[in-house]
Interface confidence: low
């Protein structure tokens, strides 16, 4: 082992501390970058929201038109009764069999009770409900109700989170320009270096100690920030755990129906079974029964209903897509808040640590280069450092980076910081 003089150790500590100093700056800038990202995401969310409002209006108009057509059609006297009833009698057993097969395969719970309930439901249902696509209309209305509820919930939580974020970002910590980063604390102890944490801040100012020699409690200074970030996170997270969001239509939307929804509908009131009508020829035939010879106006209304139903379904899908994008924006903001929380924790921790008496953030205590007869691989340098208030940290530097290399202390400091942060996270 080559011995290293105290002067060399001091110079190494100096270089290492410079690197740590730079990392602290980066940490502060990191917080500001996240702030910018959150603001950008919020702008995108606002644009999305206005698109959503527009899509919602179009969808509501189409739904109203569909409802009107349905009402007019219901008011007309029943025609083609015999044809429809005959087809309905043949459609029912097929529908029941298909539905029970699906239920047994997919829904994984007793089908006895469901079978009886379905029998009853089919006996009470009218082929006209079928012919008018009543199940599709009901499904659209239910979808509309869920979508409205979901957007309301999201909006409510986002506006709560937003007001907290706005308050947080009004603080001088976030508004100060980067060139102001170095700032002498007016009440610092002798020999302290320039600092990045801002006593002019609303929060810090209110907590300023009376005596210039009382050590600053940076944890108390930053605690309100951390609490606000946490509060904003909570406001954002609530809706992702509420029942409406357990299986939102926006989570991996498929053109087909989500199994859980279908199973729930079958258990609830058997309507889910009507979704399987396409698999029964006689049921499909009901949909194509032409009653125009008996009543031309009925055929016209039926056509109108079909058209408005298609438009309403298309607009509902479009709205769902926008709702999905909106939810992703929310999730994105949520994860940015998580990053902000972690980064801020780290910044506040560093702020506290840099208040120590030692002029070095990083102090090198021993350096040992190993020869081939030791346990450590030949040529590797082992450096023991103390970082802030930490226990000694041992860092190994590969043979490629010699002690004379300007990158040597940067490597040591980087590894030590990583180790320190890892330990801090585990605590």
């Amino acid at each position: 082992d080559q011995t290293v003089s105290d002067n060399e150790l001091q110079e190494m500590s100096n270089q290492g501390s410079k690197y740590v100093n730079k990392e602290i700056q980066n940490a502060v800038n990191g917080v500001k970058q996240i702030k910018t990202l959150i603001e950008k995401t919020n702008e995108e969310r606002k644009t999305l929201l206005s698109n959503l409002e527009e899509a919602k209006k179009k969808k509501e108009d189409a739904l109203n038109e569909t409802r009107e057509s349905e009402t007019k059609l219901k008011e007309l006297p029943g025609v083609c009764n015999e044809t429809m009833m005959a087809l309905w009698e043949e459609c029912k057993p097929c529908l029941k069999q298909t539905c029970m097969k699906f239920y047994a395969r997919v829904c994984r719970s007793g089908s006895g009770l469901v079978g009886r309930q379905l029998e009853e439901f089919l006996n009470q249902s009218s082929p006209f409900y079928f012919w008018m696509n009543g199940d599709r209309i009901d499904s659209l209305l239910e979808n509309d109700r869920q979508q409205t509820h979901m957007l309301d919930v999201m909006q409510d939580h986002f506006s709560r989170a937003s007001s907290i974020i706005d308050e947080l970002f009004q603080d001088r910590f976030f508004t100060r320009e980067p060139q102001d980063t170095y700032h002498y604390l007016p009440f610092s102890l002798p020999h302290r270096r320039p600092h990045f944490f801002f006593p002019k801040s609303r929060i810090v100012r209110s907590l300023m100690p009376f005596s210039p020699y009382e050590p600053l409690n940076f944890h108390a200074m930053f605690q309100p920030f951390l609490e606000m970030i946490h509060e904003a996170q909570q406001a954002m997270d609530i809706h992702f755990h509420s029942p409406a969001f357990q299986h939102p239509p926006t989570e991996f939307i498929r053109e087909g129906d989500d199994d859980r929804t279908v199973c729930r509908e079958i258990r609830h009131n058997s309507t889910g079974c009507l979704r399987m009508k396409d698999q029964c020829d006689k049921c499909r035939e009901i949909l194509s029964v032409d009653c125009s010879t008996n009543n031309p106006s009925q055929a016209k209304l039926r056509r109108e209903l079909d058209e408005s139903l298609q438009v309403a379904e298309r607009l509902t899908r479009k709205y769902n897509e926008l709702l999905k994008s909106y939810q992703w924006k929310m999730l994105n903001t949520s994860s940015l808040l998580e990053q902000l929380n972690e980064q801020f924790n780290w910044v506040s921790r560093l702020a506290n640590l840099t208040q120590g008496e030692d002029q070095y953030y990083l102090r090198v205590t021993t350096v040992a280069s190993h020869t081939s007869d030791s346990d450590v691989p030949s040529g590797v340098t082992e450096v023991v450092v103390k970082l802030f208030d930490s226990d000694p940290i041992t860092v190994t530097v590969p043979v490629e980076v010699s002690r004379k290399n300007p990158k040597f202390m940067e490597t040591v400091a980087e590894k030590a910081l990583q180790e320190y942060r890892k330990k801090h996270r585990e605590e």
């Epitope: 699906f102 395969r105 997919v106 299986h247 989570e251 991996f252 498929r254 087909g256 129906d257 989500d258 199994d259 859980r260 279908v262 396409d278 698999q279």
Partner: antibody, heavy 120, light 107 residues
Framework: EVQLQQSGPELEKPGASVKISCKAS????????MNWVKQNNGKSLEWIGN????????NYNQKFKGKATLTVDKSSSTAYMQLKSLTSEDSAVYYC?????????????WGQGTSVTVSS | DIQMTQSPSSLSASLGGKVTITCKAS??????IAWYQHKPGKGPRLLIH???TLQPGIPSRFSGSGSGRDYSFSISNLEPEDIATYYC?????????FGGGTKLEIK
């Protein structure tokens, strides 16, 4: 956006075992079955089996029972397939593919495939 | 097991033309058939499921029909990007089975 990212190509010796992975993202991992499909050098496709990530229960094509073992790690949204006692017959491209439990949905999203070569 | 017999195994057609591929199941599969397009180095792409339902984003040039044991798949107005191998898949039975594939080339 739904994505299935499979692990890289594997070169193994006869008799060895190999475990390939399929990392899923962009959807609720436990809500949908993960299938595994084999393709022998450009020939047709063969269904190996599937697994329901919610319960971790696999179904196997009888032909691949004892050869393939399907597992999932819910925490990382990753599905795995282990192939044991490898022979040259197992040299193929293996795909993971997604389908909902609803039979109206076939396997609609596929991974890019993992090539396994068995050679001494 | 349900066997799926796909024909032809390869075919060549002109741009703008139409091709039809058929699959015959060894038993009734209740319309539970899907059609895939497979290009080298990629995972298969689902075009049609439940006999004739087009996947979102798939052009209407692709179509499917059939019932019972006999099913067919067509591509009209052929385009260069349609060069691929096409497979049918039955999923009526938990043990899914594929057809042997049809390699499509452009004349």
């Amino acid at each position: 956006e739904v994505q299935l990212q499979q692990s890289g190509p594997e070169l193994e010796k006869p008799g060895a075992s190999v475990k390939i992975s399929c990392k899923a993202s962009g959807y609720s991992f436990t809500g949908y079955n993960m299938n595994w499909v084999k393709q022998n050098n450009g020939k047709s496709l063969e269904w190996i089996g599937n697994i329901d990530p919610y319960y971790g229960t696999p179904n196997y094509n009888q032909k691949f029972k004892g050869k393939a073992t399907l597992t999932v790690d819910k925490s990382s949204s990753t599905a795995y397939m282990q192939l044991k006692s490898l022979t040259s017959e197992d040299s193929a491209v293996y795909y993971c593919a997604l389908n909902s439990l609803l039979r109206l949905n076939a396997m609609d999203y596929w991974g890019q495939g993992t090539s396994v070569t068995v050679s001494s | 097991d349900i066997q799926m017999t796909q024909s032809p195994s390869s075919l060549s057609a002109s741009l703008g033309g139409k091709v039809t591929i058929t699959c015959k199941a060894s038993q009734d599969i209740n319309k539970y058939i899907a059609w895939y397009q497979h290009k080298p180095g990629k995972g298969p792409r689902l075009l049609i499921h439940y006999t004739s339902t087009l996947q979102p984003g798939i052009p209407s040039r692709f179509s499917g029909s059939g019932s019972g044991r006999d099913y067919s798949f067509s591509i009209s107005n052929l385009e260069p990007e349609d060069i691929a191998t096409y497979y049918c898949l039955q999923y009526d039975n938990l043990l899914r089975t594929f057809g042997g594939g049809t390699k499509l080339e452009i004349k």
